[in-house]
Interface confidence: medium
C-alpha cells in the first residue's frame, strides 16, 4: 500500500516518503512547481472506543506513522504521493480545470460497448501489475527483513491491490505467531464504513481510467434492492452464472471463472507470522443463498434507511441504533432498530452472495463487490444531498479505532482522513444516474446533479 519508490531501506529507516516529481532530484513533492512539500504526517490522537483496547500493538494505530513520519502534503488541487496527480474531480497540467463529473450508471443500463469496457477493464486490472504501488508482506517491525537490508514487499495486480487494501483494513492484530487479536476493523462497524469504501472505489475507478486510457470511465452500480431471491448480475453477460456441475463456482463461459482469490487465508498468515503477499489461493466462489429462501433487500428498505436523519449514534459501532450508517451497513434493520438476528442492506447482500463474498477479508476478490459498493455509496450520497450534514455530524472522538473524523483511513497512502470524504459525490468528481424512487410520493429518478 506504499509507493514502490518509497520501499527502500533509506526511506523506511528515515520514515520519509517524499519522492521527487520528474527527473530533477531537488523537485521533492513537486516543490519546484509549487505543487507540494515534504511535511510531518498528522495522525489523529483523540481517544477511540470499542473493543480494541491495546496501545502500540498494531501497525495501523496512528496510521501511517509506524511506517512514515514525513510525506508529501500537496497544495491546491494537487494530489498523490509525489503531488503529481490532481484531486478527484480536477484535471489539467496544473489541476486548474474542474472535470465534468463521471456518471456512474446502473449496470443493467450500460450499452454492450460500455459493459464490455467495464468488464474488460476489470479483467485487465486483474492481469496488469500496479504501476505505482506495492504491498507490504511483513508487519511493521519486520519490514526491513531479517538482516535489516531487504524491504519486504511484493508487486501485485491493480485489482489484487484493491483486494489487499480491503484485507489489510480488516485483518487481525497479530500479537505473536498464531495469536491473533480479533477486535479491530478499520473499514466496517463504524462511521468510516461509508467514507472508507467510497475512497476505495475512487482509487479503483482512477486506476481503471488510467489502465484503459479513458478519463470519463465510471464504475457502474448494481441496484440490489430487488427483494428477489436471485442475483440478477450473476449471469454470463455480467459477473458469471453458477457452474452447473458445481454451483459454488463460476460458469466457464465467464471471464471470471478463472479469477483466483488473494488474501483469503487469514489463519495461515497468523500462523506463519506474515501478511497476505498476493499469492493466488483458489477460485472465486459464490453460493447464492437465494435458493435457501434468503431474499435481497427491498426498495422499502432503502426508503426506511434514507429516512434516518442521524448519520451515526453512540457507541458508533455495530450496535448503534437509529443510525443511517449502521442501517446502511446492515447491522441495524433498515428502519434503524436493532435486531441481532437480522442483517439488512449491505451486509445482507454480502451474505446472500455467500462464498468469497461472505467474509470481509476476502469479499473484494469478487468483482460484484465493486458494483455492490457503488450502489451502497449511491445511497450514502443521496443521504448526504438530502440532509447536508455539518462536519460535526461525524464524531471527533470515541468512535472505534480508525473511525474518528480526523483518523487517516487505513491503509490508504498518502494519508486521507474520513472528513475529506464526507462530501457529496459531485465534489469528488462523480455522480449517479439513479433510476430509483426514494419515497412513496416521489416520481422515479434521483437528481444526477
Amino acid at each position: 500500500q506504499f509507493p514502490r519508490v518509497c520501499m527502500t531501506v533509506d526511506s523506511l529507516v528515515n520514515k520519509e516518503c517524499c519522492p521527487r516529481l520528474g527527473a530533477e532530484s531537488a523537485n521533492v513533492c513537486g516543490s519546484q512547481q509549487g505543487r507540494g512539500q515534504c511535511t510531518e504526517v498528522r495522525a489523529d490522537t483523540r481517544p477511540w472506543s470499542g473493543p480494541y483496547i491495546l496501545r502500540n500493538q498494531d501497525d495501523r494505530e496512528l496510521w501511517p506513522r509506524k511506517f512514515f513520519h514525513r510525506t508529501c502534503k500537496c497544495t491546491g488541487n494537487f494530489a498523490g504521493y509525489n503531488c503529481g496527480d490532481c484531486k478527484f474531480g480536477w484535471t489539467g497540467p496544473n489541476c486548474e480545470r474542474k472535470k465534468p463529473p463521471v456518471i456512474r450508471q446502473n449496470i443493467h443500463s450500460l450499452s454492450p460497448q460500455e459493459r464490455e469496457q467495464f468488464l474488460g477493464a476489470l479483467d485487465l486490472a486483474k492481469k496488469r501489475v500496479h504501476p505505482d504501488y506495492v504491498i507490504t508482506t511483513q508487519h511493521w517491525l519486520g519490514l526491513l527483513g531479517p538482516n535489516g537490508t531487504q524491504p519486504q514487499f511484493a508487486n501485485c495486480s491493480v485489482y489484487d491491490f484493491f483486494v489487499w487494501l480491503h484485507y489489510y483494513s480488516v485483518r487481525d492484530t497479530l500479537l505473536g505467531p498464531g495469536r491473533p487479536y480479533r477486535a479491530i476493523d478499520f473499514s466496517h462497524q463504524g462511521p468510516a464504513f461509508v467514507t472508507w469504501h467510497r475512497y476505495h472505489l475512487l482509487c479503483l475507478e482512477r486506476d481503471l481510467q488510467r489502465l484503459i486510457g479513458n478519463e470519463s470511465f465510471a464504475l457502474p452500480y448494481w441496484n440490489f434492492a430487488t427483494g428477489r431471491n436471485e442475483c440478477d448480475v450473476c449471469t454470463d453477460q455480467l459477473f458469471g452464472a453458477a457452474r452447473p456441475d458445481d454451483p459454488t463456482l463460476i460458469s466457464r463461459n465467464s471471464r471470471f471463472s478463472s479469477w483466483e482469490t488473494v488474501c483469503d487465508s487469514l489463519d495461515d498468515y497468523n500462523h506463519l507470522v506474515t501478511l497476505c503477499n498476493g499469492t493466488y489461493e483458489g477460485l472465486l466462489r459464490r453460493n447464492q443463498m437465494g435458493r435457501n429462501s434468503m431474499k435481497l433487500p427491498t426498495l422499502k428498505d432503502i426508503r426506511d434507511c434514507l429516512s434516518l436523519q442521524k448519520f451515526d449514534n453512540p457507541p458508533f459501532f455495530q450496535n448503534s441504533t437509529f443510525s443511517f450508517r449502521n442501517a446502511l451497513e446492515g447491522f441495524d434493520k433498515a428502519d434503524g432498530t436493532l435486531d441481532s438476528q437480522v442483517m439488512s442492506l449491505h451486509n445482507l447482500v454480502h451474505s446472500f452472495l455467500n462464498g468469497t463474498n461472505a467474509l470481509p477479508h476476502s469479499a473484494a476478490n469478487d468483482p460484484i463487490f465493486v458494483v455492490l459498493h457503488s450502489f451502497t455509496d449511491a445511497i450514502f450520497d443521496e443521504w448526504m444531498k438530502r440532509f447536508n450534514p455539518p462536519a460535526d455530524a461525524w464524531p471527533q472522538e470515541l468512535a472505534p479505532i480508525g473511525h474518528n473524523r480526523m483518523y487517516n483511513m487505513v491503509p490508504f497512502f498518502p494519508p486521507v482522513t474520513n472528513e475529506e470524504l464526507f462530501l457529496t459525490s459531485d465534489q469528488l468528481g462523480y455522480s449517479y444516474a439513479i433510476d430509483l424512487p426514494v419515497s412513496v410520493e416521489e416520481t422515479p429518478g434521483w437528481p444526477t446533479t
Epitope: Q138, L141, G176, V273
Partner: antibody, heavy 112, light 107 residues
Framework: QVQLQQSGAELMKPGASVKLSCKAT????????IEWVKQRPGHGLEWIGE????????NYNEKFKGKATFTADTSSNTAYMQLSSLTTEDSAIYYC?????WGQGTLVTVSA | DIQMTQSPASLSVSVGETVTITCRAS??????LAWYQQKQGKSPQLLVY???NLADGVPSRFSGSGSGTQYSLKINSLQSEDFGSYYC?????????FGGGTKLEIK
C-alpha cells in the same frame, strides 16, 4: 519452524539476581511480543509480562514490577528476563512464549 | 485486572467419554481467549485461539466455544493422550491472566 530455546536451570542464593534467556528462531523476532510466564511446582500459570523486542516496549503484571526486568537483543534474536532480590517464593519454572509457541522452560531454584 | 475462573478444578473420567471445561471472565473479553494443554514436565501447548479456532495440528475432537464472559473447551471421545492439565488465558488487555487450571485424570 518457530522455536524458542531457553537457558539452563539455575540454583541461586536468596537475595541474588538471575538473568534468564530465550532465543527465538523461525520468525521475525523484532515484530512480536515475547511473554514470560511463571509456574511454581504443582501450581498454575502466572503471567509476568511481555516485551516487544523491536521497540523495547514492555508491559508488566503489577505483581512482578520491581521483581522482573525484560530486555531484548535484536542482533542475536534473544529476549532476557532478570529476576532480582530472589526469595524461595521465586523458585519456579519460567517459560517464555511468543503467540502459539513456548520455550521448554527454565527451572530456577532459590535455596540457602 | 480481569479474573479468569476455571471449572472444574479437577476431573476424573474414562477413555471415550466427553468432557467440557469452562472458563468465566470477570468482564467481556470479546473472544480473545486461548486454551492450553500441559502434560507433566512439559511446556503448555496451544489448543484453541480466539475462543473457537483450533491451533495447527490439534485433533478435531477438541473444540472451543463461547463469547462475552463465558467460554468452554469440549473434548469428545477422550483418548489416553488427552490426560493432563488444561488452562484458559485471556488476552484482552494486560495482564493476560490464566484460569486456575483443570486437572484431567484417568478414572
Amino acid at each position: 519452524q518457530v522455536q524458542l530455546q531457553q537457558s539452563g536451570a539455575e540454583l541461586m542464593k536468596p537475595g541474588a539476581s538471575v538473568k534468564l534467556s530465550c532465543k527465538a528462531t523461525g520468525y521475525t523476532f523484532t515484530g512480536y511480543w515475547i511473554e514470560w510466564v511463571k509456574q511454581r511446582p504443582g501450581h498454575g500459570l502466572e503471567w509476568i509480562g511481555e516485551i516487544l523486542p523491536g521497540s523495547g516496549s514492555t508491559n508488566y503484571n503489577e505483581k512482578f514490577k520491581g521483581k522482573a526486568t525484560f530486555t531484548a537483543d535484536t542482533s542475536s534474536n534473544t529476549a532476557y528476563m532478570q529476576l532480582s532480590s530472589l526469595t524461595t517464593e521465586d523458585s519456579a519454572i519460567y517459560y517464555c512464549a511468543s503467540g502459539a509457541y513456548w520455550g521448554q522452560g527454565t527451572l530456577v531454584t532459590v535455596s540457602a | 485486572d480481569i479474573q479468569m475462573t476455571q471449572s472444574p478444578a479437577s476431573l476424573s473420567v474414562s477413555v471415550g467419554e466427553t468432557v467440557t471445561i469452562t472458563c468465566r471472565a470477570s468482564e467481556n473479553i470479546y473472544s480473545n481467549l486461548a486454551w492450553y494443554q500441559q502434560k507433566q514436565g512439559k511446556s503448555p501447548q496451544l489448543l484453541v485461539y480466539a475462543a473457537t479456532n483450533l491451533a495447527d495440528g490439534v485433533p478435531s475432537r477438541f473444540s472451543g466455544s463461547g463469547s462475552g464472559t463465558q467460554y468452554s473447551l469440549k473434548i469428545n471421545s477422550l483418548q489416553s493422550e488427552d490426560f493432563g492439565s488444561y488452562y484458559c488465558q485471556h488476552f484482552w488487555g494486560t495482564p493476560y491472566t490464566f484460569g486456575g487450571g483443570t486437572k484431567l485424570e484417568i478414572k
